[in-house]
Amino acid sequence: MAVTACQGLGFVVSLIGIAGIIAATCMDQWSTQDLYNNPVTAVFNYQGLWRSCVRESSGFTECRGYFTLLGLPAMLQAVRALMIVGIVLGAIGLLVSIFALKCIRIGSMEDSAKANMTLTSGIMFIVSGLCAIAGVSVFANMLVTNFWMSTANMYTGMGGMVQTVQTRYTFGAALFVGWVAGGLTLIGGVMMCIACRGLAPEETNYKAVSYHASGHSVAYKPGGFKASTGFGSNTKNKKIYDGGARTEDEVQSYPSKHDYV
């Protein structure tokens, strides 16, 4: 029961995490700037991975997409790539984990197959979460680096001048959404991997002992091991496969401890 709960919880946590990663990737507030030396109106600028927006105190708001890839820094492209890889891996992981869920029956899928699928989806969630955390962290680092750079004149010429404007910048909401979402996806992935261990059928060293009290004859079948006295050939308790002989467990299959829905 604990395995099913762990798997189910891991799935739900990962689902929330991936939804958060998608939301963060689409959000415009990755970074925000308040323009200080503006003699006209208070200008609040915010930018995402795909577009930049400006909002003025008058209520005017305008967004403009980055239609060119050339003018954008490689770091921004890298962040986009990391977030997209995270979303794709997470989506595939969700798809795989749906079929791996213990509470969902698909044909005669064995526990070993479900365990493998659970592990696969868990690893995908972990990588997805790491991608998101890495992407958000790279962007945050880019922000800090850029804004600690000197605000000296960038160039002068023809009597004109270009210099950086002193602005107050803050980490946008999308960064925090991304960090939390990445963390949740990571935790969900770890939970799936833990659940996988419980799902994997244990290689038992002995077959179940079956007792039958039918009338006068009492059958005792110790299965594949011979009682070792130290004098026989099986001194190291190696499993002895008894050709065609079958134990009661093999003749009639009872529901195993992993078969409940």
Partner: nanobody, 121 residues
Framework: EVQLQESGGGLVQPGGSLRLSCAAS????????MGWYRQAPGKQREFVAG???????NYAHSVKERFTISRDNAKNTMYLQMNSLKSEDTAGYYC???????????????WGQGTLVTVSA
Amino acid sequence: EVQLQESGGGLVQPGGSLRLSCAASGNIFRIDTMGWYRQAPGKQREFVAGISRGGSTNYAHSVKERFTISRDNAKNTMYLQMNSLKSEDTAGYYCNAQAWDPGTIRYLEVWGQGTLVTVSA
């Protein structure tokens, strides 16, 4: 790189009118605020008028009723219509723009080279 080019300056009689233009060119993503500043010989550069991307305007007290600022966002161009000019309006008029550069995630303050306005009889 963003460049600003002013035009329209010249010699005008007191009470006359002039229209200044400021055109932005280069690798522009978005210019949020544009403004006009002036600097008379031997004086500090002072703010004349400004206009935001949304059309909000602000004027220095000395020019409030006489000057009108406007802009064309599509052309990245700003205009300053100067009426009832006085001799104290004689100065070099400089165009200023605050442009957002997504490449560096920062604002750039761009200045033009200036155009001279002389009000004299």
